[in-house]
Structures are given as C-alpha cells and as structure tokens.
C-alpha cells in the first residue's frame, strides 16, 4: 500500500479469482484513543472499533472511503483504491491502446518546436468518475523539472456504438535548451483513477522524436506568364523555432488532382518556393519537416489551382 | 578551416557535408524510429557518446560569441563516431550489406572532421569506450543504438554549420 496523495491510498493486488488479497491496517488521524468506530462509504454499518482497523482487501467491494467517527463526529477519512496486477501485468483498463506507432501506446505526445513545450493526449471510453494527474521530468535517476498543466477533455468522438473521449495535457520543460542534443529522455507519467480503480501509464521520448511542425503558412500561387507553371510560395509556421537559419525545415510540394486515384506529382525542396505545373481542378499542398532529423511531417497546407 | 587558435572553418563546405551526413545517417538505418531501443537498456552502451550539451556554445548566440568551443565539441564527436563505425561493432558479424551506406557515412565523418581540423593541429579527443559485444544480435542492437545516437548528433552539427554558413561566413 502507498499514498497517492493526502488520505488517498493505493493497494496493489495480485488479481485472480479467490486471491487472498492484502491485509491493510488503517489508522485514524486523531489524538483520541477510544470510542472510535469505522464505516465504509455511505453505509452506517460499523466495521470495527478502535484507533486502527485491520481489513483484508480482495475485491473492489473492499475499496472505498473508510471513515473513523467518534460520537457522531467525523475524525478522518482514508480512500482506498485498487491497482490490479494480473499475471505480472498491471491493468490498463482505463485508457485505449492507440496502437500507433506501436502496440501498447496509451499516451501520444507531440511538440511543434524545440522550445521544450509538448502536448500529450490519450483516449478512453469512460465518461464519468474519472480523474487524471500528470507528472513529467527530464531523466529519471536525477530528474530535471518539467511542468505540466491539468489534463482536460479535448475532444469527443463517436466510434461505432461507443463514444470516445480524448484528454490532453500541455507540459513545458523548465530549463529547455533547444539547440542541445538531448541525452536524457522526457518521462511522462499519468495517474488515472476510475471510481476505485487506479492505473498508471508512462511514456518516454526525446523532444526531437515527437517534433511535428505546424503546416507552412501563407501558401500562395503566382502564375508564370505564358505557361501552365505556377510559382508556389509559403512561409515557415509561426510556431517553429527560430532563427530559421539554425532550425531549418525542408518541404514537400504536392500537386493532387480531384480524384484520389490520379498520380500525385511531388517535389522536395529546402527553399520556401517552388515551380510546379498546375492542372485544372487540382490542388497544391505543402508540408514541412525538420531538415536534419526525420521526425513527423506537418499536416498539409493546401490551395486550389484555379 | 577551423584552426584551434580561432580562424573560421569553411562554413559552406561543412554545411554541405554535414547535411549529407544527416541523409546518410538516416539511410543507414531509416526504421530505427520504429524501435524503442531504450527498452533494451542502453546504460552501458550509448551513455559514453559525446553529446552536444547546453554549455557547449552550439546555440546561435554561442556561435556568434565564439564558435570554437562548439566546433571542438563537434570535432570530438565526429572522431568518436568515426572510430565506432570503423570498429568491430560494424565490421564484425553479421556483415553489413555491400551497398550499405555505413561505409559512406564512415568516410564522410572523417571528411568533415578533417575539414574542421587540418593536419598538425590537435584538439583533445574523447576515449572510445571498449564495447565488444559477444553475440551477433548484441552487435546488431548496438549498431542501431549508435546510428540512432549519431542521427541526433549530426542533426545538431548540421544546424550549426547551416547557421554558420548563413550568418558567420566572411
């Protein structure tokens, strides 16, 4: 058993039918010595008396808010949560496996630049009685500070018969060094509590591996005289790290016909302009990627040819 | 050329070669991003590689103030990786494919290090750790880790030279 926060405790259980469970001793936080009784949740049934209460925790019915009283007055509370371990595997019932970029990916994170700011998100089908708390650090043995905000519900989607809820959190490395080569990964730890079930999820990454620039901005077409060619120009996204002479991007320019089956013409360039042939009803799209490190491409910025 | 005393390197040549190094490092092991090598416990393997750290002056301001600190650190790293790529980690079993870009990568590391430090000038170089994996699968894993680490190193070096070529070239 360990303390998650004040008056909230997590009992780790080997989880199988008829498992013996864990013996837990609760102590009433009071100078009083006698006349103390204990109850669980809203029930008025007295579970025991005395300053300590010994219970065998086996199932969710044994978890909950234990309260010690004296003469009708509440003295203190202890909330017991369960963390299930089945066959050596901690339960992951609360969050959905996003399966990208690999199986058992519960947390996904992205950064728009090298400033040390990043966003993580996760999915669940649970709509109520759900709380998250997020901690992060750079490295684990001698951790350096990363500050995370509160996790918030950022999207709701319908997937078949189920509703899916997306939560996200923003974090900022306290002393970020954008130009340095990272040697210690960022660690992100999410505590999830659904009713009386506790679970924890972790992710470990370098900022360089989760970089995904915003799409190029101010995408414009300039027709070239007496030609089907156009000059496409764009700018670095505002959110990208500066100076651009140091934090450089490379770009992919694509001409795509109306039909998805039509052949796509692609040009790669380090410049912020390119000359392409604009076909009727086609659109021109540009996306960006770090020039020197193959992290994710941005989403496309697009304009119609006509 | 970067003389330890302080004259400027051939920024544009260094920029071109470092950008080529980036391309080669990713073509040598493009799928490395899909392997979570940190799960494989790399404490003893890639902890000793020289990283370009915050105080090494490789940020735009540091380069403007005095690029020598940063260039020395980059030079150290280039020599270190050049030695690693020439060691039995890469020459031993399982053999690299004949068209593997590792050979080109090795030569380009040497080329860039020579651009930074002509013969007769000596910067301190870092000791290469004695890594001699016994099993072929351990050697393969170590190659992945070294190339992964090299990708990050050359990305910073390429940024330095690109910025230098754009802002510090005479």
């Amino acid at each position: 058993i360990w303390e998650l926060k004040k008056d909230v405790y997590v009992v780790e259980l080997d989880w199988y039918p008829d498992a013996p469970g864990e013996m837990v001793v609760l102590t009433c936080d009071t100078p009083e010595e006698d006349g103390i009784t204990w109850t669980l949740d809203q029930s008025s049934e007295v579970l025991g008396s005395g300053k300590t209460l010994t219970i065998q925790v086996k199932e969710f019915g044994d978890a909950g808010q234990y309260t010690c009283h004296k003469g009708g007055e509440v003295l203190s509370h202890s909330l017991l949560l369960l963390h299930k371990k089945e066959d050596g595997i901690w339960s992951t019932d609360i969050l959905k496996d996003q399966k990208e970029p690999k199986n058992k990916t519960f947390l996904r994170c992205e950064a728009k630049n090298y400033s040390g700011r990043f966003t993580c998100w996760w999915l669940t089908t649970i709509s109520t009685d759900l709380t998250f708390s997020v901690k992060s650090s750079r490295g684990s043995s001698d951790p350096q500070g990363v500050t995370c905000g509160a996790a918030t519900l950022s999207a709701e989607r319908v997937r078949g018969d189920n509703k899916e809820y997306e939560y996200s959190v923003e974090c900022q490395e306290d002393s970020a060094c954008p130009a340095a080569e990272e040697s210690l990964p960022i660690e992100v730890m999410v505590d999830a509590v659904h009713k009386l079930k506790y679970e924890n999820y972790t992710s470990s990454f370098f900022i360089r591996d989760i970089i995904k620039p915003d799409p190029p901005k101010n995408l414009q077409l300039k027709p070239l005289k007496n030609s089907r060619q156009v000059e496409v120009s764009w700018e670095y996204p505002d959110t990208w790290s500066t100076p651009h002479s140091y934090f450089s991007l490379t770009f992919c320019v694509q001409v795509q016909g109306k039909s998805k089956r039509e052949k796509k013409d692609r040009v790669f360039t380090d410049k912020t302009s390119a000359t392409v042939i604009c076909r009727k009803n086609a659109s021109i799209s540009v996306r960006a990627q770090d020039r020197y490190y193959s992290s994710s491409w941005s989403e496309w910025a697009s304009v119609p040819c006509s | 050329r970067a003389v330890p005393g302080g004259s400027s390197p051939a920024w544009t040549q260094c920029q071109q070669l470092s950008q080529k190094l980036c391309t080669l490092a990713w073509s040598a092991h493009p799928l490395v991003g899909h392997m979570d090598l940190r799960e494989e416990g790399d404490e003893e393997t890639t902890n000793d590689v020289p990283h370009i750290q915050c105080g090494d002056g490789c940020d735009p301001q540091g380069l403007r103030d005095n690029s020598q600190f940063c260039l020395q650190r980059i030079h150290q790293g280039l020599i270190f990786y050049e030695k690693l790529l020439g060691s039995d980690i890469f020459t031993g079993e399982p053999s690299l494919l004949p068209d593997s870009p590792v050979g080109q990568l090795h030569a380009s590391l040497l080329g860039l290090s020579q651009l930074l430090q002509p013969e007769g000038h000596h910067w301190e170089t870092q000791q290469i750790p004695s890594l001699s994996p016994s099993q072929p699968w351990q050697r393969l894993l170590l190659r992945f880790k070294i190339l992964r680490s090299l990708q990050a190193f050359v990305a910073v070096a390429a940024r330095v030279f690109a910025h230098g070529a754009a802002t510090l070239s005479p």
């Epitope: 989880w15 039918p17 199932e59 050596g88 | -």
Partner: antibody, heavy 116, light 108 residues
Framework: EVQLLESGGGLVQPGGSLRLSCAAS????????MSWVRQAPGKGLEWVSS????????DYADSVKGRFTISRDNSKNTLYLQMNSLRAEDTAVYYC?????????WGQGTLVTVSS | DIQMTQSPGTLSLSPGERATVSCRAS???????LAWYQQKPGLAPRLLIY???NRATGIPDRFSGSGSGTDFTLTITRLEPEDFAVYYC?????????FGPGTKVDIK
C-alpha cells in the same frame, strides 16, 4: 467455487467455422481477464488467446491471428472464441481459463475436430 | 517468440523419491514470470507454481520451483502416488505465452 464450462465443440470441415462458449460462475466474471488454451490429441499445451476484463484488449498466438476472435459478454458471464478458416492443425481440446496467461482455474475442455 | 524446452522427456521414479524437472527458455524470462502445471490423463491441467517459485493455492509444500533468467527447475521432494503425471512449464513474460513440451513422470 470457481466454475468454467466450455461448449460448442464438434466436428467441422477444413475452412469451416465454429464458436466456442465458456460459462463462468463462482466469481465476479467482469473483473477478471480470461484465456483460451488448447491441446492437440496426445500433444502439449498451447496458449491461444486472452482478453482483459473490459474486453478492451485482446492477444493472440501467431498460429490463430486473423482467424480466431476472442470476446466476452460480461452481462452473461460468458467468454467466446469465434474460430474461422479452420485447419486440420486446429484439432484439439479447447480449455477456457482465468487469467491473461497464468491459468489458475480451468474448464473441463471441449473437443474441436477439423476433418473432411 | 520465446521457445521453452524441458528435460528429461520422461522421468521414471518410485514413490518417495525426489523428482527434478528442468525448463529452459530461449531468452531471458523477465521478472521470473514462469509457471508450472500438472496434468493427469483425461483431466484439465492444474497450476502448481507461478512467478517461478510461488506455490498456487492448495498445492502441497513438497512442490517447489526455483530459477531465474533462462533456467528453471520444478522439484518434488517425495513423490506421492498422485504425483505421477505430465508437468509443463510456461513463460508469461512475453506474448505469445509459450509452454514447454512437457515432462512425463511415471512409475519405475
């Protein structure tokens, strides 16, 4: 007392389908992961598939991936194994068991014979 | 996948004797996630040991498990008549969870 009772086995032609069921009692079924393990006649044990308590995560042996689907109905305390594109080598006694991998409680098994 | 091998294939012993069954994994079994099962003809298997050395509920103390990494052992200190059966080891550190081929302990 924990009890697991498999049903749905029988003779099926190669390429055919079969759906096995496992009725659970004596424990809070919806709180626990469940598995299927099989045993070919005169041979050893082979783990086939597992499903977590909520049904949100499933795992399969390579030999059945893409052909077999494990599922559960917590309201009926029942575990299922839908077997499609059956092959002769799928002939075995199929056991349902509690747990992701460590089978602490087992059913008595149901025999599946794949033959033309 | 982790391959499991067991030795010997058959062990012929008399009641009261000590039985030692070995199980070897093709790669390290993390956290000693290894189980042992007993199976008698016509019956479902029964869990004996989990986490390499923990006895399952109701298993007599003559059964013990040991080992870590790639090498594991099941020991029955004094064979009782009801102990003559087939014994399987199983790793559950990595999916797919694989069983050994079994060791038959029969009466000499």
């Amino acid at each position: 007392e924990v009890q697991l009772l498999e049903s749905g086995g029988g003779l099926v032609q190669p390429g055919g389908s079969l759906r096995l069921s496992c009725a659970a009692s004596g424990f809070t079924f919806s709180n626990y992961s469940m598995s299927w393990v099989r045993q070919a006649p005169g041979k050893g044990l082979e783990w086939v598939s597992s499903i977590r308590s909520s049904g949100g995560r499933t795992d399969y042996a390579d030999s059945v991936k893409g052909r077999f689907t494990i599922s559960r109905d917590n309201s009926k305390n029942t575990l299922y194994l839908q077997m499609n594109s059956l092959r002769a080598e799928d002939t075995a006694v199929y056991y349902c068991a509690t747990g992701i991998a460590v089978a602490r409680y087992w059913g008595q098994g149901t025999l599946v014979t794949v033959s033309s | 996948d982790i391959q499991m091998t067991q030795s010997p294939g058959t062990l012929s012993l008399s009641p009261g004797e000590r039985a030692t069954v070995s199980c070897r994994a093709s790669q390290s079994v993390s956290s000693s996630y290894l189980a042992w099962y007993q199976q008698k003809p016509g019956l479902a298997p029964r869990l004996l040991i989990y986490d390499a050395s923990n006895r399952a509920t109701g298993i007599p103390d003559r059964f013990s498990g040991s080992g870590s990494g790639t090498d594991f052992t099941l020991t029955i200190t004094r064979l009782e008549p009801e102990d003559f059966a087939v014994y399987y080891c199983q790793q559950y550190s990595t999916s797919p969870f694989t069983f050994g081929p079994g060791t038959k302990v029969d009466i000499k």
